[in-house]
C-alpha cells in the first residue's frame, strides 16, 4: 500500500510553539485523540474521543518531552445530542484533575465569535499517523493547511452523511488532511478555533475528499453554558 | 502477525446466553471498532453491530437490540459479543471483524476472526 | 435502510475466463462499495474497498468499478483458488451495514 504523504497526511512539522493550545489526549502512553485547552480546567475535543480517564498532554509540539505538563482527567462531557450513528454533535468537554499552568507554549484557544466562510485557508494540526492505511506515528507535531469548502460542495461528495453542524475542510486534488490520532484536534482559521476533527474516508488523504470537522462556531454557547454548570 | 482469534465453538439450550471473545493482536487496538456479523449455515452474512475498542460506543442491528450485548477490553485487546435468549435460527457461525476507518466513522471490515461456531439445540 | 442485491446467486465458469459480478444499491452510495471473497469453512476476506481500490496482497486480476448504485467485480482470468462467494457491502451507509446476498462462483 502507498504510502500517502509523509506528514500528518502531506503536511510539515508545525513551527515550534504555534500552536500553544493544542493538546493530545493520552491512554496510558498512547496517543488517542488530539484537543484544545479553552481554559485552565478544560479541554475541548471530540465526543468519538471518549474514553473513562485520560492523560493530557500539554506544553510540548513533542510527545513524550518530559518537560511537558500531563495533567490526568477523569470527568467528561459530551454534546447531549452527539449520536454514534451519523456523528451529528461530535464534541466533547474534559474536565482536568488539576489546572494547566500557562505559559508561553501554554495557552487558551480564541473560541470563534462567527463563523468562517469558505475559502478561509486554516490549519489543521495533530500528532496522528503520517501514512494511510499503514500507520507511522509522529513524535512532533504535525501542521497542514487546508481551505473550507462550502456545504454545497461537500455534500456532492458525503451525500446525507453531511450534517448541517458538520464544517468540510481541503485542498482540491491534494492528499492534504487529518487521519487516525488527529481526532479532536483544532482546525485553526484566522486565529480563532474553528473545527474539530471528527472523520474522513479511509485510507486517510484521498484528493477530492474532504475532511469533515464539527463546526464550533455552532457550539460556543454550549461550550461556555457546560463550563460554567461543572465549575 | 496481526490477527483476530476467537473462543471455541459453543452448544447451548434455548433461552441460553452465549458469549464469543475475539483477541486483537499485531495491531494497537484502540483506533479500530469491531464488527460482529454472523452467518446462519448455507446463508449469506447478517451484520450484528459494531463497538468501538476506546469509548464503547454501541450500535446494533436493529432485530438484535435488547438481546446483544458487546463490550470491550483494552487491557487485553479483547472484544466480546453476549447473545441471550437464544433460539434455534441463532445457530450461526459467528464472525468479529475490525472495522477499518478514521474518527468517528468506519469504512470496511479489513480483518476477520477464524469464526465461532455456536449452536442453539435442545 | 440501504439494500444489496447482488446478481447473479450463482454462476459456473472455467478457469481462465472472465467474471463479472455486480452489485446494486437501493439508493446512491457514491463510490464506498466494499467486495469480500469467502471460500468454504472460511472467514471473508477483503478484497476492494472504495468501488475499486484492491485491497493490499490482493491479486491484480480483481478488479472493482462503478459508482451511485451499480457495481461490478471483474476477475479478468479466473483461477483455481478464485472459486468461492462473494460478498459486497455498501459502506457508505450509517448503520445498519447491510451485505449483498452473495454470488457464487463454481467451477463449470
Known amino acids: 500500500e502507498e504510502a500517502q504523504g509523509d506528514k500528518i497526511i502531506d503536511g510539515a512539522p508545525c513551527a515550534r510553539g504555534s500552536h500553544p493550545w493544542q493538546v493530545a489526549l493520552l491512554s496510558g502512553n498512547q496517543l488517542h485523540c488530539g484537543g484544545v485547552l479553552v481554559n485552565e480546567r478544560w479541554v475541548l475535543t471530540a465526543a468519538h474521543c471518549k474514553m473513562n480517564e485520560y492523560t493530557v498532554h500539554l506544553g510540548s509540539d513533542t510527545l513524550g518531552d518530559r518537560r511537558a505538563q500531563r495533567i490526568k482527567a477523569s470527568k467528561s462531557f459530551r454534546h447531549p445530542g452527539y449520536s454514534t450513528q451519523t456523528h451529528v454533535n461530535d464534541l466533547m468537554l474534559v474536565k482536568l484533575n488539576s489546572q494547566a499552568r500557562l505559559s508561553s507554549m501554554v495557552k487558551k484557544v480564541r473560541l470563534p465569535s462567527r463563523c468562517e466562510p469558505p475559502g478561509t485557508t486554516c490549519t489543521v494540526s495533530g500528532w496522528g499517523t503520517t501514512t494511510s492505511p499503514d500507520v507511522t506515528f509522529p513524535s512532533d507535531l504535525m501542521c497542514v493547511d487546508v481551505k473550507l469548502i462550502s456545504p454545497q460542495d461537500c455534500t456532492k461528495v458525503y451525500k446525507d452523511l453531511l450534517e448541517n453542524s458538520m464544517l468540510c475542510a481541503g485542498i482540491p486534488d491534494s492528499k492534504k488532511n487529518a487521519c487516525n490520532g488527529d481526532s479532536g484536534g483544532p482546525l485553526v482559521c484566522r486565529g480563532t478555533l474553528q473545527g474539530l476533527v471528527s472523520w474522513g474516508t479511509f485510507p486517510c488523504g484521498q484528493p477530492n475528499d474532504p475532511g469533515v470537522y464539527t463546526q464550533v462556531c455552532k457550539f460556543t454557547k454550549w461550550i461556555n453554558d457546560t463550563m460554567k454548570k461543572h465549575r | 502477525q496481526v490477527q483476530l482469534v476467537q473462543s471455541g465453538a459453543e452448544v447451548k439450550k434455548p433461552g441460553a446466553s452465549v458469549k464469543v471473545s475475539c483477541k486483537a493482536s499485531g495491531y494497537t487496538f484502540g483506533p479500530y471498532g469491531i464488527s460482529w456479523v454472523r452467518q446462519a449455515p448455507g446463508q449469506g452474512l447478517e451484520w450484528m453491530g459494531w463497538?468501538?475498542?476506546?469509548?464503547?460506543?454501541?450500535n446494533y442491528a436493529q432485530k438484535l437490540q435488547g438481546r446483544v450485548t458487546m463490550t470491550t477490553d483494552t487491557s487485553t485487546s479483547t472484544a466480546y459479543m453476549e447473545l441471550r435468549s437464544l433460539r434455534s435460527d441463532d445457530t450461526a457461525v459467528y464472525y468479529c471483524a475490525r472495522a477499518a476507518g478514521y474518527g468517528a466513522r468506519w469504512w470496511y471490515f479489513d480483518l476477520w476472526g477464524q469464526g465461532t461456531m455456536v449452536t442453539v439445540s435442545s | 435502510d440501504i439494500q444489496m442485491t447482488q446478481s447473479p446467486s450463482s454462476l459456473s465458469a472455467s478457469v481462465g475466463d472472465r467474471v463479472t459480478i455486480t452489485c446494486r444499491a437501493s439508493q446512491s452510495i457514491s463510490s464506498y462499495l466494499n467486495w469480500y471473497q469467502q471460500k468454504p469453512g472460511k472467514a471473508p476476506k477483503l478484497l476492494i474497498y472504495?468501488?475499486?481500490s484492491l485491497q493490499s496482497g490482493v491479486p491484480s486480476r480483481f478488479s472493482g468499478s462503478g459508482s451511485g448504485t451499480d457495481f461490478t467485480l471483474t476477475i479478468s482470468s479466473l483461477q483455481p483458488e478464485d472459486f468461492a462467494t462473494y460478498y459486497c457491502?455498501?459502506?457508505?451507509?450509517?448503520?445498519?451495514?447491510?451485505f449483498g446476498g452473495g454470488t457464487k462462483v463454481e467451477i463449470k
Open positions: 472504495g468501488a475499486s
Open positions: 463497538i468501538s475498542a476506546y469509548s464503547g460506543d454501541t
Open positions: 457491502d455498501g459502506s457508505y451507509s450509517t448503520p445498519p451495514i447491510t
